[in-house]
Interface confidence: low
Amino acid sequence: SLGSLAAAEPAVIAECKTRTEVFQISRNLIDRTNANFLVWPPCVEVQRCSGCCNNRNVQCRASQVQMRPVQVRKIEIVRKKPVFKKATVTLEDHLACKCETVVTPRPVT
Amino acid sequence: SLGSLAAAEPAVIAECKTRTEVFQISRNLIDRTNANFLVWPPCVEVQRCSGCCNNRNVQCRASQVQMRPVQVRKIEIVRKKPVFKKATVTLEDHLACKCETVVTPRPVT
């Protein structure tokens, strides 16, 4: 909101770089055919590019990515009892970022 | 995806805590009546609660927040020339988080 400038520090741009984000492990990453299970943990940390670039024609994008397999628990409920199984979910970490020109398609004339 | 567990580390829960996020400073935070200006910087870092809790009945919520005024530039375009003005945007930082019970209304019987 607009207001008094007293005690207001100059805003600093959130530069384009990797930051820690939370990734929700959805059940359909594990098994699309069955809904009768839980996944543990439900979310994990990943590294993702975020932030702003100097103008609107460029966007902060990952210039280097790495796939990271992690082991999760698939907890199936069988006769009201938990049966623990294992599954691997492959996470995508961003290792480096850059401000990349956004190519917008020209309208056909 | 289900797959080989070779080289897969056990997934670690993204605990409920503050993390650095990027907040886009939208123009209508500065001036709802006029669209003929730019804001600098277009985004800043804020601290926000994120992550998962031990079960689905609780959610990661901020238990302590702090409002932080920051000074931004409002760049109006007047006769194709930039006119620099100042404005204050108040950001909300989360200082502490907790896993809070989600109260879901019971169905009326």
Epitope: L38, W40, Q71, R73, I75, K80, K81, P82, V83, F84, K86 | L5, P10, N54, N55, N57, V58, C99
Partner: antibody, heavy 120, light 107 residues
Framework: EVQLVESGGGLVQPGGSLRLSCAAS????????MSWVRQAPEKGLEWVST????????YYADSVKGRFTISRDNAKNSLYLQMNSLRAEDTAVYYC?????????????WGQGTLVTVSS | DIQMTQSPSSLSASVGDRVTITCRAS??????LNWYQQKPGKAPKLLIY???SLQSGVPSRFSGSGSGTDFTLTISSLQPEDFATYYC?????????FGGGTKVEIK
């Protein structure tokens, strides 16, 4: 400081009943799964039962299924084990233990235990 | 049910010794293995969870390793207060089961 204090143990005849209690303090009891683990004299550890944080899910060892009932009262920070149709082989020290989140299935903090003796 | 087999059932060691206790599961349990220490007349205490994660407040001379069916608890330099019985426990599936225990005695 986390504290778990069991009570209710004692001498009971075969076929009799006992109700064990566990008073919890020093942590948010309602957020944690809880368990009972027992240890017969000079023997190893045996898992007995586990209950979910809200109390809606309960799990039992086959050796006690149908005879023992685990329950909790989150308003009172208390865990219970109702033991019916007791047998000589149920003689043991019974420990209550905090079992973490909903799939941790470990025993993080333990009480000091309460001795149950089933004998005629 | 998953059977957990510990070896040895007892061992004698001196202060300063490196001690290794093994635990074998009857089927693969990934890294869902926990270790406990119990002293006479006392409740057990969690030392290691998820095969290799040290519980808060546990001295760093304790370490755990292994995955699948074979696991190890190592005490790098045995201290007087470490003479106790150690149990492994699988948290892979119910019923939750413990190993038979390993008693570490003073030589």
């Amino acid at each position: 400081e986390v504290q778990l204090v069991e009570s209710g143990g004692g001498l009971v005849q075969p076929g009799g009943s006992l109700r064990l209690s566990c008073a919890a303090s020093g942590f948010t009891f309602s957020s944690y799964w809880m368990s009972w683990v027992r240890q017969a004299p000079e023997k190893g550890l045996e898992w007995v039962s586990t209950i979910s944080d809200g109390g809606g899910l309960t799990y039992y060892a086959d050796s006690v299924k149908g005879r023992f009932t685990i329950s909790r009262d989150n308003a009172k920070n208390s865990l219970y084990l109702q033991m019916n149709s007791l047998r000589a082989e149920d003689t043991a020290v019974y420990y209550c233990a905090e079992s973490g989140g909903y799939t941790d299935w470990l025993f993080g903090y333990w009480g000091q235990g309460t001795l149950v003796t089933v004998s005629s | 049910d998953i059977q957990m087999t510990q070896s040895p059932s007892s061992l004698s060691a001196s202060v300063g010794d490196r001690v290794t206790i093994t635990c074998r599961a009857s089927q693969s349990i990934s890294s869902y293995l926990n270790w406990y220490q119990q002293k006479p007349g006392k409740a057990p205490k969690l030392l290691i969870y998820a095969a290799s994660s040290l519980q808060s407040g546990v001295p760093s001379r304790f370490s755990g390793s292994g995955s699948g069916t074979d696991f190890t608890l190592t005490i790098s330099s045995l201290q007087p207060e470490d003479f106790a019985t150690y149990y492994c426990q699988q948290s892979y599936s119910t019923p939750l089961t413990f190993g038979g225990g390993t008693k570490v005695e003073i030589k």
